[in-house]
């Protein structure tokens, strides 16, 4: 119950906090549990105690073990345990699970990645940040105080992020690295009454007789994944499949495109070998979702051959 895991890499600084809290004026004693040996408070030692903190400057694999802290208050002593593991540095780029701090999630609106445990150290900006061992560069990445901000977060930004900083103790510098996973979650979606982007209401589409023509019905329905959303074409108020003209078919275009984060759908109406009678039909682009239905009507007109030649 009063135990906390801490880990670090050899030759890096590691500072551990006693799991028991008290007043600043309380004395805190530290012991190496296996030997019950008191940890010195003199800063000249590589491992020393400083109140609530136990400092390894730098850490060695042999420092691994359980450390006991006793917070001495006027009425009783509070005992806590710090389970410390120091690992050898990895030669490859992979950060093993046992070195990872808690995963954080971000979204388009909130993309802060805090550098784990940094509040324990005496560090100065800037922090260095790496993703999968590559130094982060470019205007999308901003190291701010103890966290990294990523602008315009995308799903590809998910991955393992490592912060690197220098701890200063009495003029001596020690490196510290810490890694955590970052996942990208969709912003909370919402649904709107459909908005038809194309065609315009009562648009006149010029076509050439004998040639093929395409009409695109495009509508947006809100943000995020939509529970129910559809776009379709009707001919004279009849579904394409029921109209019975094999020359006129509809096919889905770009499905659920998230440009600007909006959930949009396209439906393309393909008319093969345009005929005179096609000019007499009413073409309706329909967009519908749980909020209702919106309709834009298009008519075809013969393209003027003179315009064509010019």
């Amino acid at each position: 119950k009063f135990s906390k895991q801490s880990w670090g890499l050899e030759n890096e600084a590691l500072i551990v906090r006693c799991p028991r809290q008290g007043k600043p004026s309380y004395t805190v004693d530290w012991y190496y549990s296996q030997t019950n040996k008191s940890i010195p408070t003199q800063e000249r030692n590589r491992v020393f105690a400083s109140g609530q903190l136990l400092k390894f400057l730098p850490a060695a694999v042999a420092d691994s073990g359980i450390y006991t802290c006793i917070v001495r208050s006027p009425t009783f002593n509070r005992t806590g345990y710090a389970n410390v593991t120091i690992y050898k540095k990895q030669s490859d780029c992979n950060v093993p699970d046992y070195l990872m701090y808690s995963t954080v999630s971000g979204s388009e609106k909130n993309s802060k990645i805090y550098c784990p445990t940094i509040d324990l150290y005496n560090w100065t900006a800037p922090l260095e940040w790496f993703k999968n061992c590559q130094a982060l560069q470019g205007s999308r990445y901003r190291a701010h105080k103890s966290f990294l901000v990523i602008d315009n977060v995308m799903t590809e930004d998910a991955g393992d992020y490592t912060c690197k900083f220098i701890h200063n103790e009495n003029g001596a510098n020690y490196s510290v690295t810490a890694t955590r996973s970052f996942t990208v979650k969709d912003e909370q979606g919402f649904s709107l009454f459909p908005v038809i982007g194309a065609p315009a209401q009562n648009e006149i589409k010029e076509v050439e007789i004998g040639k093929n023509a395409n009409l695109t019905c495009s509508a947006c329905f809100g943000k995020g994944t939509q529970f129910l959303a559809a776009v379709l074409w009707q001919l004279n108020g009849t579904k394409i499949t029921d109209f019975g003209e094999p020359r006129i078919q509809q096919e889905e275009g770009q499905n659920q495109s998230f440009s600007n984060g909006l959930a949009c759908l396209d439906m393309v109406l393909r008319i093969a070998d345009v005929k005179e009678e096609d000019l007499l039909l009413q073409y309706d682009c329909l967009a519908l979702n749980l909020h209702g239905l919106r309709r834009h009507t298009v008519r075809l007109s013969r393209k003027n051959p003179i315009d064509h030649h010019s």
């Epitope: 119950k1 906090r17 028991r20 809290q21 006027p74």
Partner: antibody, heavy 116, light 113 residues
């Protein structure tokens, strides 16, 4: 600068529960415990309990044991105090106060009124 | 529980004069481990949370004017305002900061004579 910002006033019926939040900023939340103190109208200050914000271990005053629950959310740097089975004498201003040698930092207070 | 008894309940003092508030605890607040007396003093004005003035019986909190001073050890403690100012009108509380449950005195209201 250190700030403790508490949730707004509440009106509750006898027998109900109330949960008050205390959002900390300007310092590392898990470095200091958080106390809860209440003050009924015209009464002395009364300590309810505190929580070790690092490991989440609460300690309660005997007068409130069984009725009070103190929790914390480290990711939100927020401490919570929930008081159940409310009675009219629980009408008071409830404060959070950061642990230290004395309580140097207090929330602005949350007035909880218990009335039928 | 440690009982904190303050006296007087109220105190009327002329501006510029000395105000003295006493606090007695039912058990010693001295911790032999570090020789600290775990007693705090607070000032509270209407509609505001208490403000820490003194901790450790005699250590002034940063930003507190030096006209406020604390003294005492063990079970008997005193808060002194050496030269009362208009802004010092408030209720003053002592607090057992030694052991759970932390307990407060009943308060002393300081008024202008």
């Amino acid at each position: 600068q250190v700030q403790l910002v508490q949730s707004g006033a509440e009106v509750k019926k006898p027998g109900a529960s109330v949960k008050v939040s205390c959002k900390a900023s300007g310092y590392t939340f898990i470095n200091y415990g958080m106390n809860w103190v209440r003050q009924a109208p015209g009464q002395r200050l009364e300590w309810m309990g505190w929580i070790n914000t690092y490991i989440g271990e609460p300690t309660y005053g005997d007068n409130f044991k069984g009725r009070v629950t103190i929790t914390r959310d480290t990711s939100a740097s927020t401490a919570y105090m929930e008081l159940s089975s409310l009675r009219s004498e629980d009408t008071a201003v409830y404060y959070c106060a950061r642990e230290g040698d004395g309580f140097a930092y207090w929330g602005q207070g949350t007035l909880v009124t218990v009335s039928s | 529980d440690i009982v904190m008894t303050q006296s007087p309940d109220s105190l009327a003092v002329s501006l510029g004069e000395r105000a003295t508030i006493n606090c007695k605890s039912s058990q010693s607040l001295l911790y032999s481990g570090n020789q600290n007396n775990y007693l705090a003093w607070y000032q509270q004005k209407p509609g505001q949370p208490p403000k820490l003035l003194i901790y450790g019986a005699s250590t002034r909190e940063s930003g507190v004017p030096d006209r406020f001073s604390g003294s005492g050890s063990g079970t008997d403690f005193t808060l002194t305002i050496s030269s009362l100012q208009a802004e010092d009108l408030a209720v003053y509380y002592c607090q057992n900061d030694h052991s759970y449950p932390y307990t407060f005195g009943g308060g002393t209201k300081v008024e202008i004579k």
